[in-house]
Interface confidence: low
């Protein structure tokens, strides 16, 4: 039994971490930085979308490499419950707190914080220099996807590196999931292609929620047919001329559901790997 | 002066790193497995493309994941003078051998045989699982490609890592390399939209040369939309019904020129990076 | 041949409603967004509603907001104008549109029109 | 919304005369014009759209042109057919069409 309640020691924590943070703000400013130029590079690349066949290619293009670069900038994460393992040992053992307050005030202070950052910088530098869907929910929903994406990354980190006292190895089999993970995300092979017996593991990748959550966000009720009209090429049939049409090919779900599900599934997905995360660390206690 | 000459150097020196790669075939053999393994799910993730416009898709997705799978994979190469750099300086100093001795020795018996492994067992694998092109010269053309990608990767590596003590910062640099050169590729982003005052930037890029080639030799002379008589349908502009359409799109040049001039690009680049490598060994000695 | 034929017109009183149907055959009718055009006898054209492709995104003129709805069903081929509690300047001939291209809102295609008259 | 005006109301012509239509908006509209034509009875027809683009199986005769807030529809050389009311609409700003040109024989 504790002296101290749990809310205390999860302020005590949050507190630490967070002075921490502030005492080192290298690492901070440096990432917000290269966030920063990041997002005006591609924000340059990529400036103000067209609307036609380059348009659905450009879009995609964009969406996936902001999924992808949420995901793999997320493996820092590994580093959360890695480096401070010996002294969370030694703490724990002296009764300094319960593992749920370290746990919770880890996630608080430094993941929360440092995760929504780029995900905020991205989409309010992207945005507008691409000419994305003009259109207040869309915006929002673009940069709630994108923060969904850094959560649910991070918190697969902190499954896979939890208890772990090298950075290394777990860092090498994120870049490795998230590799396969990249592949189902569903702009390097289109879905609805992929044989039975392996189109499963889309279900398992978590760029693959995240893109087609920012896709259905961006292409429902697009037009990337220049000039077409009914009166002249209606017999156009092989032609993606609507972000409808274009959803459709890749097997997305048009209705409301077929966006939010993607949201339920990385929520969940974040739910088990912070589980997963925090069992390790119970565990950890146990033989140390 | 040396007592003897530049070919029994050459001579020694590949021996002597042949025997050590034979001598220590675990790193070989790992790599020729996980290149054999990711080549087989490749093949089963895109088997048998379809002719329409999910083939489009599925064709630049394989490609353009095998294109930056070589880069990405080259930056191992980083290590070939670092991991030896003191008994480079010491047996260059105690007059064993020339620095282009050791230098083409190095290439000949390391570089040039663990980076056209990959490229060949990906060719052979793939592009029957794939179901790509079903002509000889096609299939070699790939094959070529693939390991000019590698040698350019590999050497573009060589250039930022001789004459260093350590590999992590060149790893870093490298991949940070790659990741822009990726986005220039052609893929994430239509070549032909990006600004002038921008776009510039593709040339450097060495996936954006190996990839262009890839569909190229693939593409022309293909069609994508089933049952789609020639005399019909001509009015549609907006559908990508052809290779040729596809390519036009991407800003490919259709002309023979423009398959080649991409591997010139690359020859150019192995012999700039390669010359540079080799001058950082040259005055790597000078300060030693 | 694109065809476009409105049905559903005709005469009501003040505050009744009334439902426009437009069948669209000659061209891929879910490419297209759609809209309501009007024109009320001696008076010049009026843009009434619009639809996207999908039918999740709808606009509307002020004067008809919050009375008309317009929907479309793309299995049907059908666009649709639901017109509630209508009043006498409601009286006009509503065409049935097709928009060339968002974002350039040109009608393109017309239908031959159907008579609505609100009237005591 | 931006209130667009067509001059004259009227106007009498001659098969074969050169005929000039003008459309001016109470503000800048990008070129985003387009110009219908009714004849009496029947559906309104697209004869340009983006102020100078001919759209398909309209006569080459048929012009437009103009920028800011002024914009014209020329007919080079009026042939009977031609005799109908033609209307402007804006589509930058809201969606308006002005008050219509009849245009008559004389």
């Known amino acids: 039994s504790y002296t101290t309640s749990f809310c205390h020691q999860l302020r005590w924590v949050s507190k630490r971490s967070f002075k921490n943070l502030l005492g080192n703000p290298q690492a901070s400013i440096a990432q917000i930085i290269v966030t920063v130029i990041l997002g005006l590079v591609i924000g340059a690349i990529y400036f103000g979308l067209n609307n036609d066949s380059t348009g659905i290619q450009n879009r995609a293009g964009v969406l996936f490499f902001l999924t992808t670069n949420q995901c793999f900038s997320s493996v820092s994460a590994v580093e959360l419950f890695v480096v401070e393992k010996k002294l969370f040992i030694h703490e724990y053992i002296s009764g300094y707190y319960r593992v749920s307050s370290y746990f919770f005030g880890k996630l608080l202070s430094d993941l929360l914080p440092m995760r929504m950052l780029p995900s905020i910088i991205f989409t309010c530098i992207v945005y507008f220099m691409l000419g994305l869907k003009p259109t207040a929910d869309a915006f929002f929903i673009m940069m709630f996807t994108l923060m969904m994406v850094a959560y649910s990354a991070s918190s697969m980190a902190l499954a896979i590196a939890a208890g772990q006292s090298v950075v290394s190895v777990a860092t090498l089999l994120m870049t490795i999931c998230f590799v396969f993970m990249m592949i189902f995300s569903g702009l390097l092979v289109n879905l609805t292609t992929i044989a039975s017996w392996l189109s499963w593991l889309q279900y398992f990748s978590i760029p693959r929620y995240g893109f087609t959550a920012l896709q259905h966000n961006e292409f429902l009720g697009q037009n990337f047919c220049p000039g077409l009209n009914a009166t002249v090429n209606n017999t156009c049939n092989y032609a993606t001329c609507t972000g409808e049409e274009y959803l459709t090919k890749q097997g997305i779900d048009l209705s409301p559901w077929g966006l939010w599900k993607n949201h339920v599934a990385l929520a969940c997905m974040i739910v088990i790997f912070l589980t997963i995360a925090y069992l390790k660390l119970l565990f950890l206690k146990k033989y140390s | 002066s040396y007592t003897t000459s530049f070919c029994h150097q050459l001579r020694w020196v590949s021996k002597r790193s042949f025997k050590n790669l034979l001598g220590n075939p675990q790193a070989s053999i790992a790599q020729i497995i996980v290149t054999v393994i990711l080549g087989l799910v490749i093949g089963a993730i895109y088997f048998g493309l379809n002719n329409d416009s999910t083939g489009i898709q599925n064709r630049a997705g394989v490609l353009f994941f095998l294109t930056t799978n070589q880069c990405f994979s080259s930056v191992s190469a980083v290590e070939l003078f670092v991991v030896e750099k003191k008994l480079f300086i010491h047996e260059y100093i105690s007059g064993y051998y020339r620095v282009s001795s050791y230098f083409f020795g190095k290439l000949l018996s390391d570089l040039l045989p663990m980076r056209m492994l990959p490229s060949i067992i990906f060719t052979c694998i793939v592009y029957f699982m794939l179901g790509l092109k079903p002509t000889a010269d096609a299939f070699f053309i790939m094959m070529f490609t693939l390991m000019m990608v590698a040698y350019s990767a590999s050497s573009m590596a060589l250039a930022i890592a001789a004459g260093q003590s350590v590999v992590s910062v060149a790893t870093l640099l490298m991949t940070i390399c790659f990741v822009f050169m990726m986005i220039f590729s052609g893929l994430l982003v239509n070549l032909t939209t990006i600004a002038s005052w921008l776009s510039w930037l593709q040339y450097f890029s060495i996936p954006r040369y190996g990839f262009t080639a890839l569909q190229h030799n693939e593409f022309l002379g293909q069609n994508f939309c089933p049952g789609l008589n020639a005399t019909v349908n001509n009015t549609c502009n907006y559908a990508t019904c052809t290779g040729e359409e596809y390519l036009t799109k991407q800003g490919i040049d259709l002309s023979p020129w423009g398959l080649w001039k991409n591997h010139v690009a690359l020859a150019c680049m192995i012999v700039i990076f390669l010359t540079i490598a080799y001058l950082k060994l040259l005055f790597l000695k000078k300060y030693s | 041949e694109v065809q476009l034929v409105e049905s559903g017109g005709g005469l009501v009183q003040p505050g009744r409603s009334l439902k426009l149907s437009c069948a669209a055959s000659g061209f891929i009718f879910s490419r297209f967004y759609m809209a309501w055009v009007r024109q009320a006898p001696t008076k010049g054209l009026e843009w009434v509603a619009y639809?996207?492709?999908?039918?999740?995104?709808?606009y509307y003129r002020d004067s008809v907001k919050g009375r008309f709805t317009i929907s479309r069903d793309n299995a049907k081929t059908t666009l649709y104008l639901q017109m509630d509690s209508l009043r006498s300047e409601d009286t006009a001939t509503y065409y049935c549109?097709?928009?060339?291209?968002?974002?350039?809102?040109?009608?393109?295609?017309w239908g031959q029109g159907a008579s609505v008259t609100v009237s005591s | 919304d931006v209130v667009m005006t067509q001059s004259p109301s009227l106007l009498s012509a001659s098969v074969g005369d050169r005929v000039t239509l003008t459309c001016k908006g109470s503000?800048?509209?990008?070129?985003?014009l387009a110009w219908y034509q009714q004849k009496l009875g029947e559906a309104p027809k697209l004869l340009t759209y983006k102020t100078n683009s001919l759209h398909t199986g309209i006569p080459s005769r048929f012009s437009g042109s103009g920028s800011g807030t002024d914009y014209t529809l020329t007919i080079s050389s009026l042939h009977s057919e031609d005799l109908a009311t033609y209307y402007c609409y804006q589509y930058n700003n809201g969606y308006t069409f002005g008050p219509g040109t009849k245009l008559e024989l004389k």
């Open positions: 639809i996207n492709t999908g039918g999740g995104t709808t």
């Open positions: 549109t097709t928009l060339a291209a968002p974002w350039n809102y040109v009608m393109d295609a």
């Open positions: 503000q800048n509209i990008n070129n985003f």
